[in-house]
C-alpha cells in the first residue's frame, strides 16, 4: 500500500481467483484513543473499533472511503483504491490502446517546436467518475523539472455504438534548451482513477521524436505568364522555432486531382516557393518537416488551382 | 576551416556535408519505432557518446559570440562516431551489404571532421569505449542505438552549419 495523495491510498493486488489479497492497517488521524468506530462509504455498519482497523483487501467491495468517528463526529477519512496486477501485468482498463505508432500506446504526445512545450492526449470510453493527474520530468534518476497543467476533456467522438472521450494536457520543460541535443528523455506519468480503480500510464520520449510542425501559412498561387505553371509560395508557421536559419524546415508540395485515384505530383524543396503545373480542378498542398531530423510531417495546407 | 588561429570554417561546405550526413544517417536506420531501444538493456554502451549540450555554445547566440567552442564539440563527436562506424560493431554480423549507407556515412564523418580540423592542428578527442559485442543481437542493438544517437547529433551539427552559412559566412 502507498499514499497517492493526502488520505488517498493505493492497494496493489495480484488479481486471480481466490487470491489472498492484502492485509491493510488503517490508523485514525486523531489524538483520541477511545470510543473510535469505523465505517465504509455511506454505510452505517460499524466495521470495527479502536484507533486502528485491520482489513483484508481482496476485491473492489473492500475498497472505498473508510471513516473513523467518535460520538457522531467524523475524525478522519482514508480512501482506498485498488491497482490490479493480472499475470504480472498491471491492468490498463481505463485508457484505450491507440495502437500507433505501436501496440500498447496509451499516451500520445506532440510538440510544435523545440521550446520544450508539448501536448499529450489519451482516449477512454468512460464518461463519469474519472480523474487524471499528470506528472513529468526530464530523466528519471536525477529528474529535471517539467510543469504540466490539469488534464482536460478535449474532444468527444462517436465510434460505432460507443462514445470515445479524448483528454489532453499541456506541459512545459522548466529550463528548456532548444538548440541542445537531448540526451535524457522526457518522462510523462499519468495517474488515472475510475471509481475505486487506480491505474498508471507512462510515456518516454525525446522532444525531437515528437516534433510535428504546424502547416505552412499564407499559401499563395501566382500564375506564370503564358504558361500552365504557377508559382506556389508559403511561409514558416508562426509556432515554429526561430531563427529559421537555424531551425530550418523542408517542404513537400503536392498537386492532387479531384479524384483520389489520379496520380499525385510531388516536389520536395527547402525553399518557401516552388513552380508546379496546375491542372484543372486540382488542388495544391504543402506540408513541412524538420529539415535535419525525420520526425512527423505537418498536416497539409491546401489551396485550389482555380 | 577552424584553424588554430580560430578563423572561420568553410561554413557552406560544412553545411552541405552535414546535410548529406543527416540524409545518410536516416537511410542507414530509417525506422523510428520498430524497436524501442531505450527499453532494451545495455544502457552504458551509448551513454558515453558526446552530446552537444546546453553550455557548448551551439545555439545561435553562442555561435555569434564564439563559434570555436561549438565547432570543437562537433569535431569531437564526428571523430567519435567515425571510429564507432569503422569498428567491429558495424563490420561483424548481421552483414551489411557494400551499398549500405553506413560506408558513405563513415566517409562523410571523416570528410567533415577534416574540414573542421586540417592536418597538423589537433583538438582533444574523446576516448572511444572499447565495445566488442560477440553476439549478433548485441551488435545489432548497438548499431541501432549508435545510429539513432548519430541522427540527433548530426541534426544539431547541420543546424549549426546552416545558421553559420547564412549569418556568419564572410
Amino acid at each position: 500500500i502507498w499514499e497517492l495523495k493526502k488520505d488517498v491510498y493505493v492497494v496493489e493486488l495480484d488479481w486471480y481467483p481466490d487470491a489472498p489479497g492484502e492485509m491493510v492497517v488503517l490508523t485514525c488521524d486523531t489524538p483520541e484513543e477511545d470510543g473510535i468506530t469505523w465505517t465504509l462509504d455511506q454505510s452505517s455498519e460499524v466495521l470495527g473499533s479502536g484507533k486502528t482497523l485491520t482489513i483484508q483487501v481482496k476485491e473492489f467491495g473492500d475498497a472505498g472511503q473508510y471513516t473513523c468517528h467518535k460520538g457522531g463526529e467524523v475524525l478522519s477519512h482514508s480512501l482506498l483504491l485498488l491497482h490490479k496486477k493480472e499475470d504480472g501485468i498491471w491492468s490498463t482498463d481505463i485508457l484505450k490502446d491507440q495502437k500507433e505508432p505501436k501496440n500498447k500506446t496509451f499516451l500520445r504526445c506532440e510538440a510544435k517546436n523545440y521550446s520544450g512545450r508539448f501536448t499529450c492526449w489519451w482516449l477512454t470510453t468512460i464518461s463519469t467518475d474519472l480523474t487524471f493527474s499528470v506528472k513529468s520530468s526530464r530523466g528519471s534518476s536525477d529528474p529535471q523539472g517539467v510543469t504540466c497543467g490539469a488534464a482536460t476533456l478535449s474532444a468527444e467522438r462517436v465510434r460505432g455504438d460507443n462514445k470515445e472521450y479524448e483528454y489532453s494536457v499541456e506541459c512545459q520543460e522548466d529550463s528548456a534548451c532548444p538548440a541542445a541535443e537531448e540526451s535524457l528523455p522526457i518522462e510523462v506519468m499519468v495517474d488515472a482513477v475510475h471509481k475505486l480503480k487506480y491505474e498508471n500510464y507512462t510515456s518516454s520520449f525525446f522532444i525531437r521524436d515528437i516534433i510535428k510542425p504546424d502547416p505552412p501559412k499564407n499559401l499563395q498561387l501566382k500564375p506564370l505568364k503564358n504558361s500552365r505553371q504557377v508559382e506556389v509560395s508559403w511561409e514558416y508557421p508562426d509556432t515554429w522555432s526561430t531563427p529559421h536559419s537555424y531551425f530550418s524546415l523542408t517542404f513537400c508540395v503536392q498537386v492532387q486531382g479531384k479524384s483520389k485515384r489520379e496520380k499525385k505530383d510531388r516536389v520536395f524543396t527547402d525553399k518557401t516557393s516552388a513552380t508546379v503545373i496546375c491542372r484543372k480542378n486540382a488542388s495544391i498542398s504543402v506540408r513541412a518537416q524538420d529539415r535535419y531530423y525525420s520526425s512527423s510531417w505537418s498536416e497539409w495546407a491546401s489551396v485550389p488551382c482555380s | 576551416r577552424a584553424v588554430p588561429g580560430g578563423s572561420s570554417p568553410a561554413w557552406t561546405q560544412c553545411q552541405q556535408l552535414s546535410q548529406k550526413l543527416c540524409t545518410l544517417a536516416w537511410s542507414a536506420h530509417p525506422l523510428v519505432g520498430h524497436m524501442d531501444l531505450r527499453e532494451e538493456g545495455d544502457e552504458e554502451t551509448t551513454n558515453d557518446v558526446p552530446h552537444i549540450q546546453c553550455g557548448d555554445g551551439c545555439d545561435p547566440q553562442g555561435l555569434r559570440d564564439n563559434s570555436q567552442f561549438c565547432l570543437q564539440r562537433i569535431h569531437q563527436g564526428l571523430i567519435f562516431y567515425e571510429k564507432l562506424l569503422g569498428s567491429d560493431i558495424f563490420t561483424g554480423e548481421p552483414s551489411l551489404l557494400p551499398d549500405s549507407p553506413v560506408g558513405q556515412l563513415h566517409a562523410s564523418l571523416l570528410g567533415l571532421s577534416q574540414l573542421l580540423q586540417p592536418e597538423g592542428h589537433h583538438w582533444e578527442t574523446q576516448q572511444i569505449p572499447s565495445l566488442s559485442p560477440s553476439q549478433p543481437w548485441q551488435r545489432l542493438l548497438l548499431r541501432f542505438k549508435i545510429l539513432r544517437s548519430l541522427q540527433a547529433f548530426v541534426a544539431v551539427a547541420a543546424r549549426v552549419f546552416a545558421h553559420g552559412a547564412a549569418t556568419l559566412s564572410p
Epitope: - | 548481421p94 551489404l97 549478433p136 545489432l140
Partner: antibody
Framework: QVQLVQSGAEVKKPGSSVKVSCKAS????????IHWMRQAPGQGLEWIGY????????KYNENFKGKVTITADKSTSTAYMELSSLRSEDTAVYYC?????????????WGQGTLVTVSS | DIQMTQSPSSLSASVGDRVTITCKAS??????VAWYQQKPGKVPKLLIY???TRHTGVPSRFSGSGSRTDFTLTISSLQPEDVADYFC?????????FGSGTKLEIK
Amino acid sequence: QVQLVQSGAEVKKPGSSVKVSCKASGYTFTDQTIHWMRQAPGQGLEWIGYIYPRDDSPKYNENFKGKVTITADKSTSTAYMELSSLRSEDTAVYYCAIPDRSGYAWFIYWGQGTLVTVSS
Amino acid sequence: DIQMTQSPSSLSASVGDRVTITCKASRDVAIAVAWYQQKPGKVPKLLIYWASTRHTGVPSRFSGSGSRTDFTLTISSLQPEDVADYFCHQYSSYPFTFGSGTKLEIK
C-alpha cells in the same frame, strides 16, 4: 518506380551454359547491389550471390562458386548471371532482386523470374 | 551456413482462423529475419523485415515476432487471398538462407 525485367525462359542441354539478364530501371543502377536467387520446382529459395555495379565486385554463395558468374553492364543498367556446366538439378526459376536501401539484404523488388529448364 | 527450419511445411485453416508459422535458425541471427509471401506463379512479396516490422502496404493482420533463433509469422484472421507459400529468410550471415516454405490453404 523501380523495375527489374528479366530475359525470357530458356531450355538448355546438360553441360551447356546459359546467361540470364536483369534490366534495372527507376533508380541509380550503381547505387545498389543486385542479388540472384533460384527456386527449383516445388522448392524453397536459394541465394546465389550479388554484384555491386559501382565497383563490379561480385560475392557468391560458396555452393555456387565455379558454377555461376555474376556481372553487370553499367551502360545498359543490366545485371547478368551465367550458369555453366548445366545439370538437370539446375532446372529452376531464377530471380534477380534488389534489397532495401538501408544496406541489409531483405528484398523489396524482384524480377519476374526466368525459368531455366535443363533437359536432354 | 545458417539453416532456417520452417514448420509446418503445409497447413490448412478456415477463413477467420489465427494462423502461426515458425522458423528456427541454427544460430543467433539477432532480428535479421524477413518473411515473404509467394502466390502460385508469382514472385515473392516482402511482408515483414527486422522480424516484426511490416513492409509498407502489408495488411495489419500479418505480424512477426521473435529474436535470435526463434521466429514466428502470425496471420490474425485468415482471409481467402492469403492462400500462398510463405518463406522466412535470414540476412544476418553469408550465405543468406531461406526456410523451405509453408504452403497455406483454406479448408
